[in-house]
Structure formats: C-alpha cells, structure tokens
C-alpha cells in the first residue's frame, strides 16, 4: 500500500540523468549548493519537488512507516542545503500517470492544468478516451464495453484510481425487488498540486447540488482552479462537472428517482491505479456474483412486457443492451418514466464514445 | 456539508478513564484521517495523535502512548479517543478534527470540543 | 523537537493590518498553516499550504512563509478578527502535528 520506494525510485531515476549515469543514494545531494549550475541547482530542485509531491501523494498510506518519514525529511534538508524553493517546476514524470508536460521544444510550456493540450503536445495526436455509466437498476456500462445489470446493494466505487473516486450508494427499488437503484452518488476530484485542491462531489435523489461540497464551483484557488467546473443545463435533474486537467467529462441525471452516471475520461487517467484498487464496476462490471440475468426479473405492476417493449422502442428503436435495459427497469419500477434513464445513458455514449461502432452492445441472454 | 460533533461535557476522578466520541457526516469517513488535538483551560492547542478509521492505524505522541486508545466505527462513521489513568493534569477541552493528511498536512473541520474536568 | 513560536499578543486598530509571525527553524522548507480560535470555540483554519485560504475565509487573510519565519498577514482588520491564531506545521521525523505557542489579536 505505501508507496514511498517508487517515490524513491523515480527521484533516483530523475537524478541520475541528471548526473548523465552513475548511482547514487535515494537522497544523495550531488553537485555544489545554492543556485549555481549543474545538479545542485535547477534540476535537482525540480526532482527533489517532484519527489515531495509524489511522498505527499502516498503520505496517508505511509503514515508511520520509518522508510517514508525519513524521505519526507531528507527531502526537507535537502531543499534547505540547495537553496530550493517548495514552489516551481518539477521533473517531468515518468510515464506511468496522465500524459507528460511536453519538453526541450522550444515552444512555449503547455498549460499543465490542460490533459488533452499536455497529451498531444507529446504524443503528436489527441489522447484515447474510455467510457462507463451506470444507469437505471443500476446497469453499468465498463470501459471494456460489459453491460452488466446489478443487483449490488450499499456503497459500491465505479471508479477508484489515483485521480478520480466515484462511489455509488444503491437500495432495494421496491421492496421484495432483486433490482436496486442508484440513490447516492459520491465523486472525489484528489487534490493536484499544480491545479485543484481536493474537491467532493455528492448527490442524491431530489438534491443535484450545482456545486461542490465546500460551496465553490471550481478547483479552487490554485493557477488552476479552472481546469474543474460544475454546471448544469436543467437544474435537479442534471449537473455536469467537466475536469480538463485529467481529460475528464462527468454527467450526473436524476430520471425516476433515481441517479444515472456518466463519464469520458482519458485512458491514462482511468487506469492509473494499483492492485488494491481493483474493485471497479467501471474496469471490471459487475462482480459475478452481483449479476442479474433478464431472467431473474420480477415483475410489479400493471405493465406488461410488450407495453414495456412498446414504451422503450419509442426512444430506443435498436434492440440492444439500452433496449433491453429500458425494458428490465420499466417491467420491474412498473413506472414509465425509467425510459428516460436508457435514453439518456445512450444519448451520453454517443456523445462520449470514441468508437461509435461501440455504441449499441447487444446482450448475450 | 462536512460536520464532526462530539460527545457532552464529563467529570472524571483521578485515574479513571474517559471515552469521547467523534461523529462525522458530509464527507466519505474512511478517505480521511482523525486527529486528537486539546486544550488545557487558558492554555494553546496540543495536538495528541492520530487515527486512519479505514486502516485502524493510530500515532500519538510519546507522552500519551500506553493510556491512550483511538478506535472508530465505520458503519456510524465515528471516531472514539479513550484516555485513561487520568490526572488534574488532563483537564483539557478536547477536539477531534479531520485530518488531511496528504493532500495537505493540516486539520481542515473541527469538532465543537468536549470538556473533561478531573477532579477529586 | 520541532518548536513554533509567536508573539504572545498582537495590537492593532480597525482598518489597520495585523501582522502575526510565527519563528521556526528552516521553517520555510515546511507547510504552514493557520488556525483562528475565537473564545469558547473550536479552532478554523483560516490559512493552508503558507498562503492558501478555504473557501469561505475573506481575501483579508494571507500568508507568507520564507527562511525562518512564517507570517499571516491581516488587512483591514475588523472587530470580529479579534482572536486567538495558532500557526502548525508538520513534524516530518517525529510524525507530529506542532502547533505554535499562540496569539492574541486583540482590536482596539
């Protein structure tokens, strides 16, 4: 869990090309003091800040462990005994996390609170997006195109990474139902130094609030704040939080007494995260066990499967996994009004989705 | 809205023990951590230790360790601090507070304090 | 380990500016954050990170933190400023919080 020896790692990495080879202890200092040239100077102060940021990204992990306290203070000595300020410029990082800030040439630095700017000016073309929702009793909709039906009840992460943690809170729809309902939506934005604090979003059913827990609508004071924005086209029915600074859309509904989630989000971004956090209804579905089959419905209700068929084709004249879904949750609710969550979470893929060939997935039952 | 409320005010004899209680709401309970900061009457701010309620982990500084016990309930997302063989000495407004820990090093929302006066 | 210290009190007339300093050994290699405590209340935080302020703390509030000393600076001081301030920063060796010894702004 304590990540503080990949820390150790990269500052060793970042180091040594700056010494052109060579080893070198994890906090060795190297080359003469203050501001003059070589490694004493510029570039082991932006690796010794990026080695703070990255102990500080693993600090709660590593909270009383002796290897991490004595890196943090390491850090701190070494910056007092180079002269270094705690802001500025960091090392570019390795290539593990979102995209690096482009380097050596000769234009202008990109905006690093902008992913998709920072992305393409490294790679020579725009960055590859993923998309998941959850609609509905909840249906989920992964990164790897599974379309799972749950029966998943309580707090359950669609997605936990080292960015991004969304959490989905759903009860019973009725009682005696296999199917439950999204009532609670929690996303945590983590804190980025250069561009957010760290900022929660929550919702529930009949409160969509159009801004973050704290009051503010943006990232906060830092240079950028604003690469993070909350806003809304239909008030309590509809919020969308867009984050530039990791490639990242969110679009959050209320249809039916219930809470639809949605996202794009850049591939890097998605799947930076470690073996711990491999409970994700977004990378990995429904676990088996939380499945339900179209058979498992249990009907309530007046409405009968081809009124439900009916209701749904008018919306959703392709009969795959949104169709089907549609039908599941308007047999089960007894309530018409759940066609508009299918509706919805298609109208979002179409927008969200790189690969429109991906949009209709038709399911295997 | 993020809120931590603590427990009523208690009177304890000299080497009982006191339990104070630390519920928090408006925020997810186990991405954060809990510190334990008091206050003597009339005095500046001490700050006790430390409790991860998604880990169990605590730290508490030198002088309380061995009568100091931090424990919480996820389920009631609440934070419990227990201080025993108490003196004179450890009358004291006491705070829960969360912990940013990480994202920042610092204690962002406070409980409104507990009072615990021990007295024979 | 790791000490904090303030001015026991600070002065200042309505309209003026508080300046409160907080002394610590290499202090600026350290975060530093503050925390305003009003009689019979708990403690906020008024400062983060040297000179960031929470949503909800007014623009008069800033800070400032280079070589070995801190300073939260308080312009156009108000009536309602009147508190106590506490400085704090985190031990990294001893895995301690360390608050400072505390002032009291008093407006006259």
């Known amino acids: 869990q304590c990540k503080i020896l990949r820390c150790n790692a990269e500052y060793v990495s970042s180091t040594l090309s700056l010494r052109g080879g060579g080893s070198s202890g994890a906090l060795r200092g190297g080359g003469g003091g203050g501001r003059g040239g070589g490694v004493g100077s510029g570039g082991l102060c932006r690796a010794l800040r990026s080695y703070a940021l990255c102990t500080r990204r693993t600090a709660r992990t590593c909270r009383g462990d002796l290897a991490f306290h004595s890196a943090v203070h390491g850090i701190e000595d070494l910056m007092i005994q180079h002269n270094c300020s705690r802001q500025g410029p960091t090392a570019p990082p390795p290539p593990r996390g979102p995209a690096l800030p482009g380097a050596g040439s000769g234009l202008p630095a990109p905006d690093p609170c902008d992913y998709e700017g920072r992305f393409s000016r490294l790679h020579g073309r725009p960055p590859g997006f993923l998309h998941c929702a959850s609609f509905g009793d909840p249906h989920v909709r992964s990164f790897h195109h599974h379309f799972h039906t749950c029966r998943v009840q309580g707090a359950w992460p669609l997605l936990d990474n080292d960015f991004l943690f969304v959490q989905a809170t759903s009860s019973p729809m009725a009682l005696g139902a296999n199917a439950t309902a999204t009532r609670k939506l929690t996303i945590i934005f983590k804190n980025m130094q250069e561009c957010i604090d760290q900022k929660v979003y929550q919702a529930e059913v009949d409160n969509l609030p159009v801004a973050f827990e704290d009051g503010s609508i943006n990232g906060g004071d830092r240079p950028g704040g604003s690469s993070l924005s909350i806003q809304t086209a239909n008030p309590g029915n509809h919020v969308e939080i867009q984050a530039a600074y990791i490639g990242t859309t969110i679009i959050i509904r209320q249809t039916a007494g219930q809470l639809s989630f949605s996202i794009k989000v850049a591939e890097d971004v998605a799947m930076a995260f470690s073996a711990e956090q491999d409970l994700q209804l977004c990378v990995g579905g429904c676990p088996p066990s939380q499945r339900l089959s179209r058979s498992e419905r249990n009907r309530r209700g007046a409405i009968t499967i081809d009124t439900a068929r009916r209701l749904c084709k008018e919306g959703l004249p392709v009969e795959d996994a949104y169709f089907h879904s549609c039908v599941f949750d308007v047999l089960i609710s007894g309530d018409p009004n759940f066609t508009v969550a299918a509706q919805a979470a298609l109208e979002d893929a179409r927008a969200f989705l790189p690969d429109l060939e991906k949009l209709h997935l038709f399911p295997s039952d | 809205e993020v809120q931590l409320v603590q427990s009523g005010a208690e009177v304890k004899k000299p080497g009982a023990s006191v339990k104070v209680s630390c519920k928090a709401s408006?925020?997810?309970?186990?991405?954060?951590?809990i510190a334990w900061v008091r206050q003597a009457p009339g005095q500046g701010l001490e700050w006790m230790g430390w409790m991860n309620p998604d880990s169990g982990n605590t730290g508490f500084v030198q002088k309380f360790k061995g009568r100091v016990t931090a424990t919480s309930n996820t389920d009631i997302t609440t934070a419990y601090m227990e201080l025993s063989s108490l003196t004179s000495e450890d009358t004291a407004v006491y705070y829960c507070a969360r912990d940013r820990f990480g994202s920042g090093y610092d204690l962002d929302h406070w409980g409104q304090g507990t009072l615990v006066t021990v007295s024979s | 380990s790791y000490e904090l210290t303030q001015p026991p009190s600070v002065s200042v007339a309505p309209g003026q500016t508080a300046r409160i300093t907080c002394g610590g050994n290499?202090?600026?290699?350290?975060?530093v954050h503050w925390y305003q405590q009003k009689p019979g209340q708990a403690p906020v935080l008024v400062v983060y990170?040297?000179?960031d302020r929470p949503s909800g703390i007014p623009e008069r509030f800033s800070g400032s933190n280079s070589g070995n000393t801190a300073t939260l600076t308080i312009s156009r001081v108000e009536a309602g400023d009147e508190a106590d301030y506490y400085c704090q920063v985190w031990g990294s060796s001893s895995d301690h919080y360390v608050f400072g010894t505390g002032t009291k702004v008093t407006v006259l």
């Open positions: 290499n202090i600026g290699s350290k975060s």
């Open positions: 408006g925020y997810i309970f186990t991405n954060y951590d």
């Open positions: 990170d040297d000179s």
